[in-house]
Amino acid sequence: TLNSVLNSNAIKNLPPPLGGAAGHPGSAVSAAPGILYPGGNKYQTIDNYQPYPCAEDEECGTDEYCASPTRGGDAGVQICLACRKRRKRCMRHAMCCPGNYCKNGICVSSDQNHFRGEIEETITESFGNDHSTLDGYSRRTTLSSKMYHTKGQEGSVCLRSSDCASGLCCARHFWSKICKPVLKEGQVCTKHRRKGSHGLEIFQRCYCGEGLSCRIQKDHHQASNSSRLHTCQRH
């Protein structure tokens, strides 16, 4: 069943040992159950690929998004699906492949001339009690009149950090995502203590730059857990 996929976390197809011949089986591992796809056919393993269950886009690969595999199916059962290419239908930015974003329900290139106004950004409503669904997805809201500047510059609307110029990352700002500077030494950073807690941030910070990590500031070790200040520090 679909639910059993979410409960399974054994490695499904071990690769051959280092130096081993292709096709040589590894250690015994659990088999993944099939998954039902549109049309009702059971998903069979193709080239050893098994659907990867997920709860949010960040669990998937950079060219994937997390969604229910069936239209109108169980919204609680989601897997990583291949991103949608240009001109394909979409409901939110993460569905579109890198270099594209979702506009009016279609994936369009974000690599166009200097400036584009009036992009429409579909977002998942994180708050409120209305959990109505459309094709198994959470209800979305549209924000218009966002400005899209030259690709990758600070303040540009983005989908992933790879859309931003060097030294910038893609981080949430209100309910959109824009390119923000990667944090430098001494700057305050965010450490997520609870799983998924970053989903509640409306002013998300970038990660720390190369050679830095987000650690508790030395003079804040004695402070209470809730008031601990993290900063980017050298290793």
Epitope: K12, L14, G61, T62, E64, A82
Partner: nanobody, 129 residues
Framework: EVQLVESGGGLVQSGGSLRLSCTAS????????MGWFRQAPGKEREFVAA????????HYVDSVKGRFTISRDNAKDTVQLQMSSLKPEDTAVYYC??????????????????????WGQGTQVTVSS
Amino acid sequence: EVQLVESGGGLVQSGGSLRLSCTASGRTFDNYAMGWFRQAPGKEREFVAAISWALSRTHYVDSVKGRFTISRDNAKDTVQLQMSSLKPEDTAVYYCAAAPRPKRVSFSYFSTSSNYEYWGQGTQVTVSS
């Protein structure tokens, strides 16, 4: 310089426990999967366990499921492998490794050693009967 340094190995009796630790330095590994592999004398290196870059999703080879637990602490840039109910066949050099978030993720991604960019020098675990 990027470094992964393992510690916590040693000699333990069958049925005993050990806790391996891997400390990362030189870059942030928040967007990397962290894994443990092992290599016994005269054998190929094999996958043991991995933990994803998001939501701490864990993966294990069947032979260690229920006995080993992998965890990570991004605040300290460390990954741990808690090993209990150890058996003589668990004797090996244990390596910590880091794999970047791929374009497409699959269960087999985590167990494929060639996906791991950074490797530690290893720590010896010996389980006596």
